[in-house]
Amino acid sequence: EWVMPPIFVPENGKGPFPQRLNQLKSNKDRGTKIFYSITGPGADSPPEGVFTIEKESGWLLLHMPLDREKIVKYELYGHAVSENGASVEEPMNISIIVTDQNDNKPKFTQDTFRGSVLEGVMPGTSVMQVTATDEDDAVNTYNGVVAYSIHSQEPKEPHDLMFTIHKSTGTISVISSGLDREKVPEYRLTVQATDMDGEGSTTTAEAVVQILDANDNAPEFEPQKYEAWVPENEVGHEVQRLTVTDLDVPNSPAWRATYHIVGGDDGDHFTITTHPETNQGVLTTKKGLDFEAQDQHTLYVEVTNEAPFAVKLPTATATVVVHVKDVNEAPVFVPPSKVIEAQEGISIGELVCIYTAQDPDKEDQKISYTISRDPANWLAVDPDSGQITAAGILDREDEQFVKNNVYEVMVLATDSGNPPTTGTGTLLLTLTDINDHGPIPEPRQIIICNQSPVPQVLNITDKDLSPNSSPFQAQLTHDSDIYWMAEVSEKGDTVALSLKKFLKQDTYDLHLSLSDHGNREQLTMIRATVCDCHGQVFNDCPRPWKGG
């Protein structure tokens, strides 16, 4: 029958070549000579000449070793023709299957594989995967079946087998407890890939396992006890730098220190921050210290990390003994700003008040007083007692020096220390009013018509305060009341002047006497211009009208 089963040819055959594979035979050769030929890739098309056929005998010949990794199967066609060239059979399919030999070693996809795992992880945790390929047949044979193994581990600490590898997937897992980055930050594994499912050819690669840091080390103080000396009263003064060591990765959150004052700072005098470069705790004063109140502070400082501890760890504590150094402190006025009342116009030499300072220092020092700011030169101070007396006439109404009834004075107290120090006190003199000003009308010129005149209203002011001010009373004197009338408004702060009788156009002087509620009288001359006009007039008398 004109059929042929598949021909299995092992790759890498040693020959001799040409090698007879199989014989084609047509049963139609009884009365005629048959010629055989083959076509297809490997015969008459690329790769040409791998296979040929003996034209007359029909033997299929192989001319060279085959390579399964290049071509797994050749599909050829066998032809049978008679002497005259006529086809005597249909083209016959010839399948030549190249069978595998273990002629390829496994190859890792990388020379070096890199992976990482957190220190202290559970045995069983997977780390990374390595991959090798083998060009041989892994379906019908074990030639291409790769088995992975770990050949060696460096360093061999704490055990020589810290990792294992899945035989068929190449997944590397932790097998032992004790991964500690601070002891071994990196492992180098020589991994093997062996074909024949572990029984054949071997190739190696390197797997580098980086051990990642966990915050499994607490920062520790080095040293644990500190002593510092700080001048009193200084704010922001650097008291001490506290140094810590931490075995975790430098400049990582597991290494960066966070400091807390956990005891000894009841008055909230101190603060501690982390120095960004050195990781030291910088202890500074938040408030000034007071030698006289407390000459020593014992602080307890705790240190943790920016990152939370990965495991339960003891927290380190340092002790800082802060000695407060005494400095010559300035005397302090009590109160620093003193408000007192003084009557304006008191006699020179009269006592205004006593304003004294206290020296915070323990040793008795002599305090002397001076006035540093007294813009009107109204006051004097006794250098020994701090008694303040009038040296000029205090005037509440002096707007240059007195604002809102208050006259501000600065007093200095200087101690006898070496060097001496000076404290400042502010004396706020609230000046009480006396009736030292009379009422004044405004304006002091009026213009009025001599026919049906409109009364002219003047405003009355008095620099004094109530009750030495409004309501006011008005009176015309020196016979001014013959032609004129003065009438104070109901509110008592304006006066209306009006003509009682006809006056010819001219300028007249009126004597207006105004008295305040405290009966202080003030005489003011009012210049009145009378015009020939009716009703109201403004600015000037109207010019007489001349007919044409």
Partner: antibody
Framework: EVQLLESGGGLVQPGGSLRLSCAAS????????MSWVRQAPGKGLEWVSA????????YYADSVKGRFTISRDNSKNTLYLQMNSLRAEDTAVYYC??????????WGQGKMVTVSS | QSALTQPASVSGSPGQSITISCTGT?????????VSWYQQHPGKAPKLILS???KRPSGVSNRFSGSKSGNTASLSISGLQAEDEADYYC???????????FGGGTKLTVL
């Protein structure tokens, strides 16, 4: 001598709670992962829970997840298993064991936990 | 049902040899050389007798040996003694949680 010693077993009603302790000695306790394994009467061994050496990672069998809590105090060299919402099927001898190198070794002597009304 | 398969029981006479098999998969026994065997006497805790397929902890008799082929591991006991009568459990390291799988146990009877 490496030793693990359990305590705290006993009889408890369904829905009740119990805490097992396992005191370790003879090895650096904090360096080793630990496991709890149980064995129901007449049955085989069943893995229950595990914890890393630091105590930072914990793992549970599906059958106990959400009801049991594994913990450790490395300063006291002690492993714990807090068992809540106990069921009849939790009745077993509970063993603590060190886990590493692909094996469980050593084992504690075991503590019987009986869940019954 | 246990992840690893063991015969429920085996028996042998004193002086004889026996073998207990433990069959797993390509993800446990077949994948790793981390097969352990434990001996458990009635009322006692399991005791490790072999680790990493064939490593004996100190104090364990050399009559106990282990081997592995493919997905199956075996425990062999030679020169059976009366005190060998116990339950024997195999375990294997495995990929992923719970990282350890047990066999159902084999009861060894010394006749």
């Amino acid at each position: 001598e490496v030793q693990l010693l359990e305590s705290g077993g006993g009889l408890v009603q369904p829905g009740g709670s119990l805490r097992l302790s396992c005191a370790a000695s003879g090895f650096t306790f904090s360096s080793y992962a630990m496991s709890w394994v149980r064995q129901a009467p007449g049955k085989g061994l069943e893995w229950v829970s595990a914890i890393s050496g630091s105590g930072g990672s914990t793992y549970y069998a599906d059958s106990v997840k959400g009801r049991f809590t594994i913990s450790r105090d490395n300063s006291k060299n002690t492993l714990y298993l807090q068992m809540n919402s106990l069921r009849a099927e939790d009745t077993a001898v509970y063993y603590c064991a060190s886990w590493g190198d692909g094996t469980l070794n050593p084992w504690g002597q075991g503590k019987m936990v009986t869940v019954s009304s | 049902q246990s992840a690893l398969t063991q015969p429920a029981s085996v028996s042998g006479s004193p002086g004889q040899s026996i073998t207990i098999s433990c069959t797993g998969t390509s993800n446990d026994v077949g994948a790793y050389n981390y097969v352990s065997w434990y001996q458990q006497h009635p009322g006692k805790a399991p005791k490790l007798i072999l680790s990493e397929v064939n490593k004996r902890p100190s104090g364990v008799s050399n009559r106990f040996s282990g081997s592995k082929s493919g997905n199956t591991a075996s425990l062999s006991i030679s020169g059976l003694q009366a005190e060998d009568e116990a339950d024997y459990y195999c375990s294997s390291f495995t990929s992923g949680l719970p990282w350890v799988v047990f066999g159902g146990g084999t009861k060894l009877t010394v006749l």
